[in-house]
């Protein structure tokens, strides 16, 4: 299969509500009409799939119903949002893009975005 460059930010800080967003951009060598995007988490040399979606160019990304990810596409950019993150989910999140159709098939894997998640401090009890 053919290789393709994928770019993503090096570091992202999740919001206090456990939401992190980043852009995954791929250098499409041709006019792909069908794309598959997968987010993988690498931590302690273990790689696990976070979510995956396919989309037709110009349409919304379709994630599984129980996915913690949402996203939109614009040209060769995919805007990804991961929700429900906790401090223990801190890690390297890697964007993988596959151009499924038309042939030839292209595969690109980003260097990863280090997402830092800080659990919010509980509110102190009020005396009132």
């Amino acid at each position: 299969c053919k290789a393709m460059h994928v770019a993503q930010p090096a570091v992202v800080l999740a919001s206090s509500r456990g939401i992190a967003s980043f852009v995954c951009e791929y250098a499409s060598p041709g006019k792909a009409t069908e794309v598959r995007v997968t987010v993988l988490r690498q931590a302690d040399s273990q790689v696990t799939e976070v979510c995956a979606a396919t989309y037709m160019m110009g349409n919304e990304l379709t994630f599984l119903d129980d996915s913690i990810c949402t996203g939109t596409s614009s040209g060769n950019q995919v805007n990804l949002t991961i929700q429900g993150l906790r401090a223990m989910d801190t890690g390297l999140y890697i964007c993988k893009v596959e151009l499924m159709y038309p042939p030839p098939y292209y595969l690109g894997i980003g260097n990863g975005t280090q997402i830092y998640v800080i659990d919010p401090e509980p509110c102190p009890d009020s005396d009132f």
Epitope: C1, L40, V47, E49, A52, I94, L107
Partner: nanobody, 119 residues
Framework: EVQLVESGGGVVQPGGSLRLSCAAS????????MGWFRQAPGKEREFVAD????????YYADSVKGRFTISRDKSKNTVYLQMNSLRPEDTALYYC????????????WGQGTLVTVSS
């Protein structure tokens, strides 16, 4: 060294069926994904189908959706491609491929098995 060996190719009439097999040997297998690609003479290599082994989730190219089915047998380290309602345009060399991890890419490839659909 991991080896992928395909079998099951052959000559079949339009509308017929074939079942391709891909057996992995020579290593310890916990592949992230296994898939099938094909290449017709003078054309680019094309994605056909894959299965992500942890969730058993399958994905198909539009051109084969509803006609082809990918499955796996973990105990035999084997992945299958059941091909029904074959068409002349399905004629190609079919390759099995394996992804050791989600970020490795398709590191392992078989030698291919030829499928010819002709009357």
């Amino acid at each position: 060294e991991v080896q992928l060996v395909e079998s099951g190719g052959g000559v079949v009439q339009p509308g017929g069926s074939l079942r391709l097999s891909c057996a992995a040997s020579g290593g310890t297998f916990s592949f992230y994904g296994m898939g099938w690609f094909r290449q017709a003479p003078g054309k680019e290599r094309e994605f056909v189908a894959d299965i992500r082994t942890s969730a058993g989730r399958t994905y198909y190219a539009d051109s084969v959706k509803g006609r082809f089915t990918i499955s796996r047998d973990k105990s035999k380290n084997t992945v299958y491609l059941q091909m029904n309602s074959l068409r002349p345009e399905d004629t190609a060399l079919y390759y099995c491929a394996a992804e050791p991890s989600g970020i490795s890419g398709w590191d392992y490839w078989g030698q291919g098995t030829l499928v010819t659909v002709s009357s």
